[in-house]
Interface confidence: low
């Protein structure tokens, strides 16, 4: 019968020829005139057999990622008789893997959105690299992910590529971060190859800022001839949040005279001071009222940021009008 071990040839061998192994019939005692032949795809071009000994050589550099095995056929003929000594047999030459492919991130560019102030451990996104090397061959395609840029705000799970938040972030300080992830094969051991990808992580706004008046004191004037409903001036607060999180409502906190009202212009987010009752210079020529401002939408879990609404004082001077 045929005698051989399993045949392996390392890929990317630079030598002009590489000995793979030997095909032999157990009837070959060294005295026979046995001729070994190699047939099939690659025979005579990629692989050469020493027909006298059955030694097989690879004469071309092989790339496992292009082709991982070759199925060939072996024959042994007794030259003396011209007859086959053994039945023709099929055998396999496997191309063994070397770590010649770096991990590649195929789904880039990566982009993720995560709410600001998300707690530590919040999942942001999973990045996945693939490695064309053989996953069953040692650690050539076993990847470890690490963070090249993004500390201390982000971390990556070494085996999954899951990016998580490791420190709370405030959108009002920085609204986007570039995280660079490296995937290293060979589980990071010497000889490892690596690939990197960038992840743009954008922070979405949460209502973690209350509106605050721009001024602690506003001075307005109103003519005593002004009818009720007259807009006598505007007050303004600012809110570092954006969108609906910056929508605000103004209201009167103190007005003993109950002479004024404040309505909110939801387009400009200004407070408009309105005359609720007519004023009389001769009766009272100035007023002091206090206004407050609050956000329109505040989820329960964010109320801690909204204790003690911002207030401002408004001094209103009544202008005298000559009366007949």
């Amino acid at each position: 019968g045929w005698v051989w071990n399993q045949f392996f040839v390392p890929e990317e061998m630079n030598t002009t020829s590489h000995h793979i192994g030997q095909l032999r019939s157990d009837l070959d005692n060294g005295n026979n005139s046995f001729q070994y032949k190699l047939l099939g795809a690659g025979a005579g071009s990629t692989f050469i057999i020493d027909e006298r000994t059955g030694d097989i050589y690879a004469i071309q550099k092989l790339d496992r990622e292009e082709r991982s095995l070759y199925i060939l056929r072996a024959q042994v003929i007794d030259i003396a008789t011209g007859r086959a000594v053994e039945p023709e047999s099929e055998f396999v030459i496997k191309v063994s893997d070397i770590n010649d492919n770096e991990p590649k991130f195929l789904d880039e560019p990566y982009e993720a959105i995560v709410p600001e102030m998300s707690p530590e451990g919040t999942l942001v996104i999973q990045v996945t690299a693939s490695d064309a090397d053989d996953p069953s061959s040692g650690n050539n395609a076993r990847l470890l992910y690490s963070l090249l840029q993004g500390q201390p705000y982000f971390s990556v799970e070494p085996t999954t590529g899951v990016i998580r938040i490791s420190s709370k972030m405030d959108r009002e300080l920085q609204d986007e971060y570039w995280v660079i992830i490296q995937a290293k094969d060979m589980i990071g051991q010497p000889g490892a190859l690596s690939g990197t990808t960038s992840v743009l992580i954008k922070l979405s706004d949460v209502n973690d800022n209350k509106p605050i008046f721009k001024e602690s004191l506003y001075r307005l004037t109103v003519s005593e001839s002004a009818p009720t409903g007259t807009s006598i001036g505007t007050i303004m607060a600012y809110d570092n949040d954006i969108g609906e999180n910056a929508e605000m409502d103004y209201s009167i906190e103190e007005d003993d005279s109950q002479t004024f009202d404040i309505i909110t212009n939801h387009e400009t987010q200004e407070g408009i001071v309105i005359l609720k009752k007519k004023v009389d210079f001769e009766h009272q020529n100035h007023y002091g009222i206090r206004a407050k401002v609050k956000n329109h939408h505040v989820p329960e879990q964010l109320m801690k940021y909204h204790t003690e609404a911002s207030t401002t004082f408004i001094k209103i001077q009544v202008e005298d009008v000559d009366e007949p």
Epitope: P109, L148, Q149, W178, I180, T196, T197, S198, L200
Partner: antibody
Framework: QVQLQESGPGLVKPSETLSLTCTVS????????WSWIRQPPGKGLEWIGY???????NYNPSLKSRVTISVDTSKNQFSLKLSSVTAADTALYYC????????????????WGQGTMVTVSS | DIVLTQSPGTLSLSPGERATLSCRAS???????LAWYQQKPGQAPRLLIS???SRATGIPDRFSGSGSGTDFTLTISRLEPEDFAVYYC?????????FGQGTRLEMK
């Protein structure tokens, strides 16, 4: 404002190694990507490769076997080495900066050096 | 590699006219990561447009960029004498970064 200045020999012999340095002034080399680009006389532009300040590199596959780009953050410099040069490597060599800050992704080149002419001749 | 083909090779126009320069990519440019540069003799290229349509700092608004996928255009709405130069497009959506061969804009 940030300025780039290339320096190095203007004449290199065939088969030798071309070595150029780009000095960054008016700003830090940190947190940006820095590229080398060349332009043969009367021809278009060819990207050679980049280096990030941490030392990671990416090279044009057409030149990869001959190119090494390195960085010296302490001197605010990065360098190009191109081995086994031939006359085809005669060109105006520019250093340039990606306009993206802390980006792993490429961006356009917003700042360029004035270029240094390198002739390969014996 | 992504190959960028610019047309026309040379464009002869007079000051005040409108210039339209084309850049076609051999495959789609990811994220419209395409830039335009102007280069005058003896000078380094100057960034005009990035992201296909965003003007760089200090670039006059007569320069505008448009396009996506494989077809991109640089338009100069009203040519000034200082606009006559060579214009290059560049893609940076995929490594290696590549440039077009250039369009020479000359005065008629």
């Amino acid at each position: 404002q940030v300025q780039l200045q290339e320096s190095g020999p203007g004449l290199v012999k065939p088969s030798e190694t071309l070595s150029l340095t780009c000095t960054v002034s008016g700003g830090s080399i940190n947190s940006y990507y820095w590229s080398w680009i060349r332009q043969p006389p009367g021809k278009g532009l060819e990207w050679i490769g980049y280096i990030y300040y941490i030392g990671s590199t990416n090279y044009n596959p057409s030149l990869k076997s001959r190119v090494t780009i390195s960085v010296d953050t302490s001197k605010n410099q990065f360098s190009l080495k191109l081995s086994s040069v031939t006359a085809a490597d005669t060109a105006l060599y520019y250093c340039a900066r990606d306009s993206r800050y802390r980006s792993g992704w490429y961006d356009a080149f917003d700042i360029w050096g004035q270029g240094t002419m390198v002739t390969v001749s014996s | 590699d992504i190959v960028l083909t610019q047309s026309p090779g040379t464009l002869s126009l007079s000051p005040g006219e409108r210039a339209t320069l084309s850049c076609r990519a051999s495959q789609s440019v990811a994220g419209s990561y395409l830039a335009w540069y102007q280069q005058k003799p003896g000078q380094a290229p100057r960034l005009l447009i990035s992201g296909a349509s965003s003007r760089a700092t200090g670039i006059p608004d007569r320069f505008s960029g448009s396009g996506s996928g494989t077809d991109f255009t640089l338009t100069i709405s009203r040519l000034e004498p200082e606009d006559f130069a060579v214009y290059y497009c560049q893609q940076y959506g995929k490594s290696p970064i590549t440039f077009g061969q250039g369009t020479r804009l000359e005065m008629k």
